[in-house]
């Protein structure tokens, strides 16, 4: 970096750093400057954060322009507003068993992460938080015409299915599925879940599915006709293969995506449908998965703001794919 | 962590009582099920019984007038007890975990002869 | 007395698809079984695969998935690997006891 030419700072006031960033001087003594945070690409301009420990590592000396924030032997650890000393082991929560090493934090649960199958005696079987306990446990939810030691009990064994008729358990449940969120990315594979109640035990459960709005390597505004401000749903000219993780979609999909506009409006899916796609892995694994497919696209100017955690109503709904009741338990 | 692990005499009379342990970590029986499966020299697996997680058994009809198994909830122990024992009682023992039989001890090698 | 069946052996090729089944002696295996999947490979513990008719075990790799078929138990692996090659129990509950199938030896070719 040549710091012999005249300082040129890219903004009048000094930027605003996240909470638990530091504000430093750029390596020329110029500008002030967010410092770059462990494992973050830095340069001379663009210094790693002093205060955690951290230098820009620029590996062999053939490369000095670029480097990776490094924290130095011995560096302390700032975490939950708190600082610990390289080798300092701490409790995050009651549920975690944390350590500083070098400026890096690892923790450890300290709850059981076990999972239960059903059986006869917890045929469904579910983790809750119990008051003045840290860590969830398990209890089985179950019919009332259970004995108090297990299943044996040979009155109630006449029914073919054990437990309550579950159309009686459902006769009281007030049905409400929300609709789907928006797709946690604009472009690229994303997640979008919904809340549902439309399972046997009337249960409150979070439904996920994986979504792609638009691929990320297109370039749809290339698209756009002479006059036109939008293009809405951009024919796909070949079908494609999906990526998850390394995987990919055994078969290929005529997928519809959504397109793009011009005038500051944002193309997203109005009318999607839900279908199971199984994706295979390098290692020979297959894993099925629940994914939107789009139906149709609408163009708004109801857009997200960029930091707007809570998206309008009108982008985060998904409508038409209520009918879809894909269970995850 | 779980883990189960069968511990008992290796050698037992004829017409003499099986007295098996089962000790448990990394769960709590009060919370899950434990069963006895034994498994013959080259065969394959014969589930002998259960205690529930609030203390009822259930036991396979072949042994119902000889079996018994209780729990020591304080030391997260589960025992198995067959009386009369014969040779065809010899067995490698197994205890498991209730849901889908998830964890299963190493198993504890039972020879009956006099 | 309740008899359980399983197929003896079975062989696959690596990359194949393969059904167990477990067949009751007293008509259709419906979900209140419990229909349970145990795996032992040579030299090691057993371990459960799946319980309730179709929940894995943490364990348990997406190619194995447990369904009912045709009124029988049923544990299909997807995209076989040379280390499914193990010893497969299933065992069903009859509302005051268990019953294990004979078990199924799988081989898995090359």
């Known amino acids: 970096q040549d710091c012999s030419a005249q300082c040129q700072c890219a903004a009048e006031a000094a930027p605003h750093c996240p909470a638990g960033v530091s504000l430093v001087l750029d390596g020329c003594g110029c500008c002030r400057v967010c410092a770059k945070q462990l494992g973050e690409l830095c340069t001379e301009r663009d210094p790693c954060d002093p205060h955690k420990g951290l230098f820009c590592d620029f590996g062999s000396p053939a490369n000095r322009k670029i480097g990776v924030c490094t924290a130095k032997d011995g560096a302390p650890c700032v975490f939950g507003g708190s600082v610990y000393r390289s080798g300092e082991s701490f409790q995050s929560s009651c549920k975690y068993q944390c350590t500083c090493l070098d400026g890096a934090v690892g923790c450890v649960p300290l709850c059981s992460m076990d999972v239960r199958l059903p059986s006869p005696d917890c045929p469904f079987p579910r983790r809750v938080k119990l008051p003045g306990k840290c860590c969830e446990e398990w209890v089985c939810d179950e019919p009332k015409d259970r004995t108090a030691v297990g299943p044996a009990l040979a009155a109630y064994r006449l029914e073919d299915t054990f437990g309550p008729d579950p159309t009686m358990m459902r006769a009281n449940c007030l049905v409400q599925t929300t609709e789907w969120s928006a797709c946690s990315k604009t472009c690229g594979m994303g997640i979008s879940t919904r809340v549902t109640n439309d399972n046997t035990f009337c249960r409150l459960e979070k439904q996920s599915r994986l979504c792609m709005v638009r691929p990320c390597e297109a370039d749809l505004e290339e698209n756009i006709k002479k006059g036109k401000k939008c293009i809405r749903t951009p024919k796909i000219a070949k079908p494609v293969k999906f990526e998850l993780s390394g995987c990919t979609s055994v078969k290929t999909y005529r997928a519809k995506f959504c397109g793009v506009c011009t005038d500051g409006r944002c193309c997203t899916p109005h009318r999607t449908t839900t279908l199971p796609v199984e994706f295979k892995c390098p290692d020979g694994e297959i894993m099925k998965k629940n994914m939107m497919f789009i139906k149709t696209c609408a163009c708004h100017y109801n857009c997200p703001g960029d930091n707007d955690i809570f998206e309008s109503l009108y982008y985060r709904k998904m409508y038409g794919d209520m009918a879809h009741h894909h269970h995850h338990h | 962590e779980v883990q189960l692990q069968e511990s008992g005499p290796g050698l037992v009379k004829p017409s003499q009582t099986l007295s098996l342990t089962c000790t448990v970590s990394?769960?709590?029986?009060?919370?899950?099920?434990v069963h006895w499966i034994r498994q013959h020299p080259g065969k394959g697996l014969e589930w002998i019984g259960v205690?529930?997680?609030?203390?009822?058994?259930d036991y396979n009809a072949a042994f119902m007038s000889r079996v018994t198994i209780s729990k020591d909830t304080s030391k997260n122990q589960v025992s198995l007890k067959l009386s009369s024992v014969t040779a065809a009682d010899t067995a490698v023992y197994y205890c498991?975990?209730?849901?889908?039989?998830?964890?299963w001890g190493q198993g504890t090698t039972v020879t009956v002869s006099s | 007395e309740t008899v359980v069946t399983q197929e003896p052996s079975l062989t696959v090729s690596p990359g194949g698809t393969v059904t167990l089944t477990c067949r009751s002696s007293?008509?259709?295996?419906?979900?209140?079984?419990?229909a349970n999947w145990v795996q032992q490979k040579p030299g090691q513990a057993f371990r459960g695969l799946i319980g309730?008719?179709?929940n894995r075990a943490p364990w348990t790799p997406a190619r194995f998935s447990g369904s009912l078929l045709g009124g029988k138990a049923a544990l299909t692996l997807s995209g076989v690997q040379p280390e499914d090659e193990a010893e497969y129990y299933c065992?069903?509950?009859?509302?005051?006891?268990?019953?294990f199938g004979g078990g199924t030896k799988l081989t898995v070719l090359g």
């Open positions: 007293i008509g259709a295996v419906t979900t209140s079984n419990y």
């Open positions: 065992a069903l509950w009859y509302s005051t006891h268990y019953v």
């Open positions: 205690i529930w997680r609030r203390g009822g058994t």
């Open positions: 498991a975990r209730d849901g889908g039989f998830d964890y």
């Open positions: 309730g008719t179709s």
């Open positions: 990394g769960f709590s029986i009060s919370t899950f099920g």
